[in-house]
Amino acid sequence: SVTVHSSEPEVRIPENNPVKLSCAYSGFSSPRVEWKFDQGDTTRLVCYNNKITASYEDRVTFLPTGITFKSVTREDTGTYTCMVSEEGGNSYGEVKVKLIVLVPPSKPTVNIPSSATIGNRAVLTCSEQDGSPPSEYTWFKDGIVMPTNPKSTRAFSNSSYVLNPTTGELVFDPLSASDTGEYSCEARNGYGTPMTSNAVRMEAVERNVGV
């Protein structure tokens, strides 16, 4: 029987470092090895018939035990599939190796209205583009961490908001007078130093009532 296997199905490596993606196989007399890369909608062939393809040949080398990168970039993050078949036969096996190229978060950008109307919906956003794996976000009001559930802490029990740590979106609905304050957010992805945005003050103002 044929086997295709990797003892490291997930590899995490800082950007600009070398890495080897292992693929061990047995039971093939004339193995034909291919590696493909998948990331979202993108699929690329890294290795075809035991040879690295042109788009990778300057920085990837084929070995009998896997493929080795001289230096990885954040764009290399994705799933690599090692596919082994018998030359001219019907034996086949494959194994997937997930590569996560570690990049620390950059300083997050916030979009916070300087004033918003009490009783209305107010949306605050926080994002950063560099972090790999993607960052999770924590919001602060006047330097105090905002819990995911406002009712869980006395300091925020009068607020009504939904906080999404994955997208970085903070939605007040409805906004109350006590929501006035200075807001900032922090991005962290478990690698490198967490980064904090600038703090921006938001005023919760009364609705203008026409005379």
Partner: antibody, heavy 116, light 106 residues
Framework: EVQLVQSGAEVKKPGASVKVSCKAS????????MHWVQQAPGQGLEWMGY????????RYSEKFQGRVTITADTSTDTAYMELSSLRSEDTAVYYC?????????WGQGTLVTVSS | DIQMTQSPFSLSASVGDRVTITCQAS??????IAWYQQKPAKAPKLFIH???TLESGVPSRFSGSGSGTDYTLTISSLQPEDFATYYC????????FGQGTKVEIK
Amino acid sequence: EVQLVQSGAEVKKPGASVKVSCKASGYSFTDYSMHWVQQAPGQGLEWMGYIDPYNGGTRYSEKFQGRVTITADTSTDTAYMELSSLRSEDTAVYYCARQTDYFDYWGQGTLVTVSS
Amino acid sequence: DIQMTQSPFSLSASVGDRVTITCQASQDINNYIAWYQQKPAKAPKLFIHYTSTLESGVPSRFSGSGSGTDYTLTISSLQPEDFATYYCLQYDNLWTFGQGTKVEIK
């Protein structure tokens, strides 16, 4: 014939560092990752980490991370394992082992004794 | 991390006995287990890989079996040269050894 030949026994003082070598022959050194395994007296085997000699990429066990450095010299087909800030519990035999998927060939072992 | 629980820690047996050593993984390791024999002051020697594939030169009295999380090394008829310590190694996800089983003369 595949052979892994390690350097001789070492005696070190606590706080010092030790560097153990493992010379490979009988195969293409850069094709296979080289691992290091610790065996304390009367104890079992513990995986420490490895190096891909082709590109110098390494991975270390959490237990040894920060104290162990594995390197390789492709001009001499030799792998090295350096352990720093030695303490008495580092007294052990250290083995290099070639990885196919499992470990198929092992060095003869190097005894490192840490004693004041 | 995958943990490997090997048992027994030690066993006493006589020449000709059937000996069984087990390793239990903390999760399914998909048959990616190897067995090593180690004699005093010697390096471990690979005996079996991928659950049941014997290395060349290993006597046929040694066999491996199992699936999922439970694996066994069996020596069908113990010989004098088999007294040693045996270790299992999972290599499905990184590498973890069992604690070892010392096979002693009764």
